[in-house]
Interface confidence: low
């Protein structure tokens, strides 16, 4: 209890202070003295919980002394001045510095007053996300990879996607002692529908103001998926030329288109122009099955279309496009 007639003095400090690995940090600590109160501070002391002896002392006549003089410094205390600010700066923060510290004022006539501060040592992680290029496997494989390197505490990684998929996360010690590298794989059964779609890796960490979002554009390599368009079942004799298109989706891109029929090579009225097939006017009915064969680096696939050119008045029908 303070002696009769004295108001109490209070030590003010935050309960927790964050600092970054390798950086410097100030542990703030102030003595709040009521108006008209006579208070004499003879010594400022900092000690770490669980360790004997003081790490930093500032004496009213002898000045400062430190357990590690290159790493500690009273930021405001000066000989000959009133000792009201015990704030201590720590340089080159290490993992081992994390812990509870006591800031203590030795005062007269009130006695000793102290407060505890928790120093939390953080390391801001570096985050990267990359695609894992895959082929059609028929089973779940990692399709994207998100890495948060050198965080303390470890970052939390989650994935956002409307494609389904499953996260698989692992941790290893980081390059700097006390840090952690978190790797998260996003796993899904590859399909052509997934190729070119995006997934987002979200990384959360105490040192971030808001979560970091990293977008990965998925790559699935697959052989061509082929269809033929441009035929509407209404082609008649005497109409002008028409065009069929061989529509192919593939990754990588198609390297070649080859048109043929079930009977062998193309008939004279059909002229191949890459992905397109020009159908010239004919003077007798036709019933032919056309084949488009598309090749890419992973293989070849084909589509078939049976085309009929029928007798009948072209004026009454939509058909081969007119000029």
């Amino acid at each position: 209890w303070p002696p009769p007639g004295t108001g109490d003095v209070v030590v003010q400090a935050p309960t927790q202070v964050p600092g970054f690995l390798g950086d410097s940090v100030t542990l703030p600590c102030y003595l709040q003295v009521p108006n008209m109160e006579v208070t004499h501070v003879s010594q400022l002391t900092w000690a770490r919980h669980g360790e004997s002896g003081s790490m930093a002392v500032f004496h009213q006549t002898q000045g400062p002394s430190y357990s590690e003089s290159k790493r500690l410094e009273f930021v405001a205390a000066r000989l000959g001045a009133e000792l009201r600010n015990a704030s201590l700066r720590m340089f080159g923060l290490r993992v081992e510095d994390e812990g509870n510290y006591t800031c203590l004022f030795v005062t007269f006539p009130q006695g000793s007053r102290s407060v505890d501060i928790w120093l939390r040592v953080l390391a801001k992680p570096q985050n990267t996300a990359e695609v894992q290029k895959v082929q059609l496997t028929g089973e779940p494989v990692p399709m994207a990879r998100c890495v948060s390197t050198g965080g303390r505490p470890p970052a939390q990684i989650t994935w956002h996607s409307d494609l389904g998929g499953m996260p698989n996360t692992s941790q290893v010690p980081g390059f700097l002692s006390g840090t952690v590298t978190v790797t998260s794989l996003w796993i899904l059964v590859p399909s052509s529908q997934v190729d070119g779609k995006n997934v987002t890796c979200k990384v959360e960490h105490e040192s971030f103001e808001k979560p970091q979002l990293l977008t990965v554009n998925l790559t699935v390599y697959y052989p061509p998926e082929v269809s033929i368009s441009g035929y509407d079942n209404n082609w008649y004799l005497g109409q002008n030329e028409a065009t069929l298109t061989c529509d192919a989706r593939s990754n990588p891109e198609p390297t070649g288109y080859n048109w043929s029929t079930t009977m062998g090579p193309l008939p004279p009225f059909a002229v191949a122009q890459g992905a397109q097939l020009l159908i010239r006017p004919v003077d007798k009915p036709i019933n032919t099955t056309l084949i488009c064969n598309v090749t890419n680096a992973l293989g070849a696939r084909q589509a078939e279309l049976t085309v009929q050119v029928k007798e009948g008045p072209p004026s009454e029908h939509s058909g081969i496009s007119r000029n």
Epitope: Q156, P167, T169, S170, Q171, E204, K210
Partner: antibody, heavy 115, light 107 residues
Framework: EVQLQQSGAELVRPGTSVKLSCKAL????????MHWVKQTPVHGLEWIGT????????AYNQKFKGKATLTADKSSSTAYMELSTLTSEDSAVYYC????????WGQGTTLTVST | DIQMTQTPKFMSTSVGDRVSVTCKAS??????VVWFQQKSGQSPKALIY???YRYSGVPDRFTGSGSGTDFTLTISNVQSEDLAEYFC?????????FGAGTKLELK
């Protein structure tokens, strides 16, 4: 201060459906997944699933697929869980929580399914 | 699904004691484990994440350790307000799974 306000206790008949709500206050609703957890004396804590309110993306525990449907309304910062074709097995306390870096859970909604 | 086997189910203790609760995962979950405390009639409250990191405001008598498949929550110098049920939970893979719980009671 983060707060999660869950809807009040429900007493419902078997075979019906119920929609529980969870209003989030004090943080950016669209930044964090909202998870739902079931608690019973027999099975303890069971994770039902999660929704990311920003994108609407969901993930479910296979056990609760077809039973629970998760939705979120960004304008009111409210997450919902609808439970269908209720049986006595669905009687439990249901919690919502953003989990991960946040410690906060709702106060829980007690659901009783009984004739 | 990953099973989290928690032991013991019940534990009797006295104020000032040191107690440990263990959780064994059925497969490697790195350090992706959270420990929760749940007092009677209340919601669970997270104490530890990433196996060993205390949430701010959690007293330092609560310590988490372990990685891979074996995890421990230790309470040194048990206080009366620590009497509660404790759960572990893995978040390495969906579905997230919890341990069955350990009830801490007074002798």
């Amino acid at each position: 201060e983060v707060q999660l306000q869950q809807s009040g206790a429900e007493l419902v008949r078997p075979g019906t459906s119920v929609k529980l709500s969870c209003k989030a206050l004090g943080y950016t609703f669209t930044d964090h997944e909202m998870h739902w957890v079931k608690q019973t004396p027999v099975h303890g804590l069971e994770w039902i699933g999660t929704i990311h309110p920003g994108s609407g993306v969901t993930a479910y525990n296979q056990k609760f697929k077809g039973k629970a449907t998760l939705t979120a309304d960004k304008s009111s910062s409210t997450a919902y869980m609808e439970l269908s074709t209720l049986t006595s097995e669905d009687s439990a306390v249901y919690y919502c929580t953003p989990l991960w870096l946040r410690r906060d859970w709702g106060q829980g909604t007690t659901l009783t399914v009984s004739t | 699904d990953i099973q989290m086997t928690q032991t013991p189910k019940f534990m009797s203790t006295s104020v000032g004691d040191r107690v440990s609760v263990t959780c064994k995962a059925s497969q490697n979950v790195a350090t992706n484990v959270v420990w929760f405390q749940q007092k009677s009639g209340q919601s669970p409250k997270a104490l530890i994440y990433s196996a060993s990191y205390r949430y701010s405001g959690v007293p330092d008598r609560f310590t988490g350790s372990g990685s891979g498949t074996d995890f421990t929550l230790t309470i040194s110098n048990v206080q009366s307000e620590d009497l509660a049920e404790y759960f572990c939970q893995q978040y390495n893979n969906y579905p997230l799974t919890f341990g069955a719980g350990t009830k801490l009671e007074l002798k």
